[in-house]
């Protein structure tokens, strides 16, 4: 589905204004910040999305708490820029003419630098780790029970082709979910895993960005899991370019 | 159809207690933020605070802070408002408001009437 | 965040075009909507993010403004209009303007 035509809102993204005024009345959502008008009937990319959160009503940080267990926020908040398809562009810069190289889901991959710094390309990251630890349970999940629950869940909430899902480990109390897509392999249409993982961090976190829909209720057989911690490692498909000194 | 349904009106003496539900029906109950609306006679509307049903937060604006606590009950989908220690001031009409992605209250109920009076 | 609506009355005619005002004591960037309250009625929300029409709201209202300065708009002015009608902010917490009366001359 796309924008719900009965109240006018975007099932995929709160963080967007919609009003009835797209060709014949149809209901049109733009995302905030960037005034981008979404596909409300897929995910938004992770740079709009950031773009939104940076213009949000104060009350989104305000009234949203991060649930009890959830990691403190420290995945770089920036203002980005997005290119017309709602990418990220290779070089970020902030307001003192700072300039960095990003990849594709955002995150810094060189030295920070000034303007004259070159980014040749949007360097894609095809290979996401996400380290979960679990809260105590009376035992540990079923390990393929916990394989099917978690794939279902990028399959339906987040509509990743279950082919991205390499793998699920686990070994009690941490669960690692391997999402792996290069270049080749995303076909049009297909969710990028790195948006997938930025749904499911901000889900994690109980700052749901689903229209209407609660948190994450997450049960493997009935039973409860509940994430108390989350470690998101992100591979490129070219290493970064980082000095040694950033090193020692 | 979005519906949010409220108790009906009540006359309470000073110094007692009230309290309000608001049934929701028609959408995703823990989605969405619910919020407190005081209207006294003659006077401005008034914000009076906020609870997501999903993690069960609230937030009060500060004049009610003491005077107001707001519940949940999601296996019913209601969000409840005491009122503590009443006085002649808090007659009022009392609407629950649903909050929309962006806050804003997209949705409301017919009102509850609380007369306080000795 | 204080809101400052004006004017507090108003009196016009089926047809002419009516201008309400709020201020915000402070950049609220384009977090405001508008309500049109009947009496014994619950608000109706008519327009937010400043300029947007909620749905199934007639085209002859509309909205402008952002940082401080708002306006609402009656294009022309139709009997069942009448109501008082209120401004939010929704930027930090919630204000509400104190309403503008409108009636019909």
């Known amino acids: 589905h796309t924008a719900a035509q009965d109240n006018c809102t975007c099932p995929t993204n709160k963080m967007t204004v919609c009003s009835p005024d797209g060709p014949g009345g149809r209901c049109q959502c733009r995302a905030l910040g960037s005034g981008m008008a979404v596909d409300c009937s897929t995910l938004t990319s992770k740079c709009l999305l950031l773009k939104a959160r940076m213009s949000a009503p104060k009350n989104a940080r305000t009234l949203v708490r991060p649930s009890e267990h959830a990691l403190v926020d420290n995945d770089g908040l920036y203002d980005p820029d997005c290119d017309p398809e709602g990418r990220f562009k290779a070089r970020q810069c902030n307001q003192t003419s700072v300039c960095w190289c990003v990849n594709s889901v955002g995150v810094r991959r060189t030295d920070k630098g000034d303007l004259s710094l070159r980014c040749d390309e949007l360097v894609r990251t095809h290979h996401i780790l996400i380290d979960l630890r679990h809260r105590p349970t009376a035992g540990a999940f079923n390990h393929s029970d916990l394989d099917a629950e978690l794939r279902r869940l990028f399959r339906e909430r987040y509509r990743l082709h279950p082919k991205f899902v390499a793998a699920v480990h686990y070994e009690q109390p941490t669960i690692q979910i391997e999402l792996r897509q290069n270049t080749s392999q995303k076909a049009a249409g297909d969710v990028d895993i790195g948006d997938a993982a930025y749904y499911f961090e901000r889900d994690i976190k109980g700052e749901s960005l689903f229209q209407g829909r609660g948190g994450l209720d997450l049960r493997v057989r009935g039973e409860p899991l509940q994430v108390e911690r989350t470690l998101i490692y992100y591979l490129d498909e070219i290493p970064p370019k980082f000095s040694m000194k950033r090193l020692t | 159809q979005v519906q949010l349904v409220q108790s009906g009106a009540e006359v309470k003496k000073p110094g007692a207690s009230v309290k309000v539900s608001c049934k929701a029906s028609g959408s995703s109950f823990t989605g969405y933020t619910m919020n407190w609306v005081k209207q006294a006679p003659g006077q401005c509307l008034e914000w009076i605070g906020i609870?997501?049903?999903?993690?069960?937060?609230?937030t009060y604006n500060q004049k009610f802070q003491g005077k107001v606590t707001i519940t949940v009950d999601k296996s019913t989908s209601t969000v409840y408002m005491e009122l503590s220690s009443l006085r002649s001031e808090d007659t009022a009409v009392y609407y629950c408001?649903?909050?929309?992605?962006?806050?804003?209250?997209?949705?409301w109920g017919q009102g509850t009437t609380v007369t306080v009076s000795s | 965040i204080q809101m400052t609506q004006s004017p507090s009355s108003l009196s016009a005619s089926v047809g002419d075009r009516v201008t309400i005002t709020c201020q915000a004591s402070?950049?609220?960037?384009?977090?405001l909507a508008w309500y049109q309250k009947k009496p014994g009625k619950a608000p109706k929300l008519l327009i937010h993010?400043?300029?947007n029409l909620q749905t199934g709201v007639p085209s002859r209202f509309s909205g402008s403004g952002s940082g401080t300065d708002f306006t609402f708009t009656i294009s022309s002015l139709q009997p069942e209009d009448i109501a008082t009608y209120y401004c939010?902010?929704?930027?930090?917490?919630?204000?509400f303007g104190c309403g503008t009366k409108l009636e019909i001359k």
């Open positions: 609870i997501n049903p999903y993690q069960g937060d609230t």
């Open positions: 993010y400043t300029s």
């Open positions: 408001a649903r909050g929309a992605g962006l806050y804003y209250f997209d949705y």
């Open positions: 939010l902010q929704y930027d930090d917490l919630f204000t």
């Open positions: 402070q950049d609220i960037n384009k977090y």
